[in-house]
């Protein structure tokens, strides 16, 4: 089971109208540039076989991947939203840095790896898709970690 006291984010992180609006605006801008509507990165399958108590840890993995492999490489795009949203998400990632899981997390890594593989397979359009799903990332983090 996760070390649950560390796999928590304060509700206030998701109640800041300005940065929430910027996150959702960034997602919308990117989704307008996303031509591949048949693929969904963040959805029910991501959580398959993952208990409610493990979902924040899973979302931490997705958040870190999104920051390191998607947002940082694409940081010059979708301005001015990107320059404000990336530090916000990085702060959430930092607050989850001590969120770990005790025991086997193979089932979680397997699910996250599928998401990573899909993004990599789609190349730049996969990165755009991931940015277009930042609203879903935001909501999933909120539901899993507060």
């Amino acid at each position: 089971a996760p070390i649950s006291s560390h796999c928590r984010l304060d509700k206030s992180n998701f109640q800041q109208p300005y940065i929430t609006n910027r996150t959702f605006m960034l997602a919308k801008e990117a989704s307008l540039a996303d031509n591949n509507t048949d693929v969904r990165l963040i959805g029910e399958k991501l959580f398959h076989g993952v208990s409610m108590s493990e979902r924040c840890y899973l979302m931490k993995q997705v958040l870190n991947f999104t920051l390191e492999e998607v947002l940082f490489p694409q940081s010059d795009r979708f301005q001015p939203y990107m320059q404000e949203v990336v530090p916000f998400l990085a702060r959430l990632s930092n607050r989850l840095s001590t969120c770990h899981i005790e025991g086997d997390d193979l089932h979680i890594q397997r699910n996250v790896q599928k998401l990573k593989d899909t993004v990599k397979k789609l190349g730049e359009s996969g990165e755009i898709k991931a940015i277009g799903e930042l609203d879903l990332l935001f909501m999933s983090l909120r539901n899993a970690c507060i």
Epitope: P17, T20, F24, K28, R40, G43, E44, H48, D135, L136, M139
Partner: antibody
Framework: QVQLVESGGGLVKPGGSLRLSCAAS????????MSWIRQAPGKGLEWVSA????????YYADSVKGRITISRDNAKNSLYLQMNSLRAEDTAVYYC????????????WGRGTLVTVSS | DIQMTQSPSTLSASVGDRVTITCRAS??????LAWYQQKPGKAPKLLIY???SLASGVPSRFSGSGSGTDFTLTISSLQPDDFATYYC?????????FGGGTKVEIK
């Protein structure tokens, strides 16, 4: 193309039971959350229940909790609504609709099936 | 539960008119709002999702705006086919909830 066809409606006495079905085609049924929504004659829309693609999560409106059970059979591309202890206020057209996940709209709806609860 | 309040409940308009319908949520729902059109005896049809995204096949005269608690559906130039009832719906949280509907009728 996407098709949702409801069946099983009819006239039932108060306290009676009914099982509604929704046959889905034209999409990968197991990928979608499915909902039941009802509309009383001359009234607005009321969401009744939803079920996740795997069937592992279910959700109900307070007005039907304990009396209604939603289920699905992904092998048969079918959605069900078991309605027990029916009341006059359950009289409505019942629609099934699909939405990809939790944060997705109901993008396709069936034509509905009428349930009348009356003695 | 999140309450959705739609106004007006009835709206009389003429072909070519610009029509605006508003929807207010009892708490913040981000942009998780959809608009549906329903004609008598028919199932609802999705028009707008994520508050402002146009659903596939929907004419561009329909547009949506807003976020948080206040939302608007606008028909830029009303056409004969647009006389119907319109519903807003939030999908930020279960239970899903609908507004009471706005009937757009011929003046």
């Amino acid at each position: 193309q996407v098709q949702l066809v409801e069946s099983g409606g009819g006239l039932v006495k108060p306290g009676g039971s009914l099982r509604l079905s929704c046959a889905a085609s034209g999409f990968t049924f197991s990928d979608y959350y499915m909902s039941w929504i009802r509309q009383a004659p001359g009234k607005g829309l009321e969401w009744v229940s939803a079920i996740s693609g795997s069937g592992g999560s279910t959700y109900y409106a307070d007005s039907v909790k304990g009396r209604i059970t939603i289920s699905r059979d992904n092998a048969k591309n079918s959605l069900y609504l078991q309605m027990n202890s029916l009341r006059a206020e359950d009289t409505a057209v019942y629609y099934c609709a699909r939405g990809l996940w939790v944060w997705d709209p109901l993008d396709y709806w069936g034509r509905g099936t009428l349930v009348t609860v009356s003695s | 539960d999140i309450q959705m309040t739609q106004s007006p409940s009835t709206l009389s308009a003429s072909v070519g008119d610009r029509v605006t319908i508003t929807c207010r949520a009892s708490e913040g729902i981000y942009h998780w709002l959809a608009w549906y059109q329903q004609k008598p005896g028919k199932a609802p049809k999705l028009l707008i999702y994520k508050a402002s995204s146009l659903a596939s096949g929907v004419p561009s005269r329909f547009s949506g705006s807003g976020s948080g608690t206040d939302f608007t559906l606008t028909i830029s130039s009303l056409q004969p086919d647009d006389f119907a009832t319109y519903y807003c719906q939030q999908y930020s949280n279960y239970p899903l909830t609908f507004g009471g509907g706005t009937k757009v009728e011929i003046k």
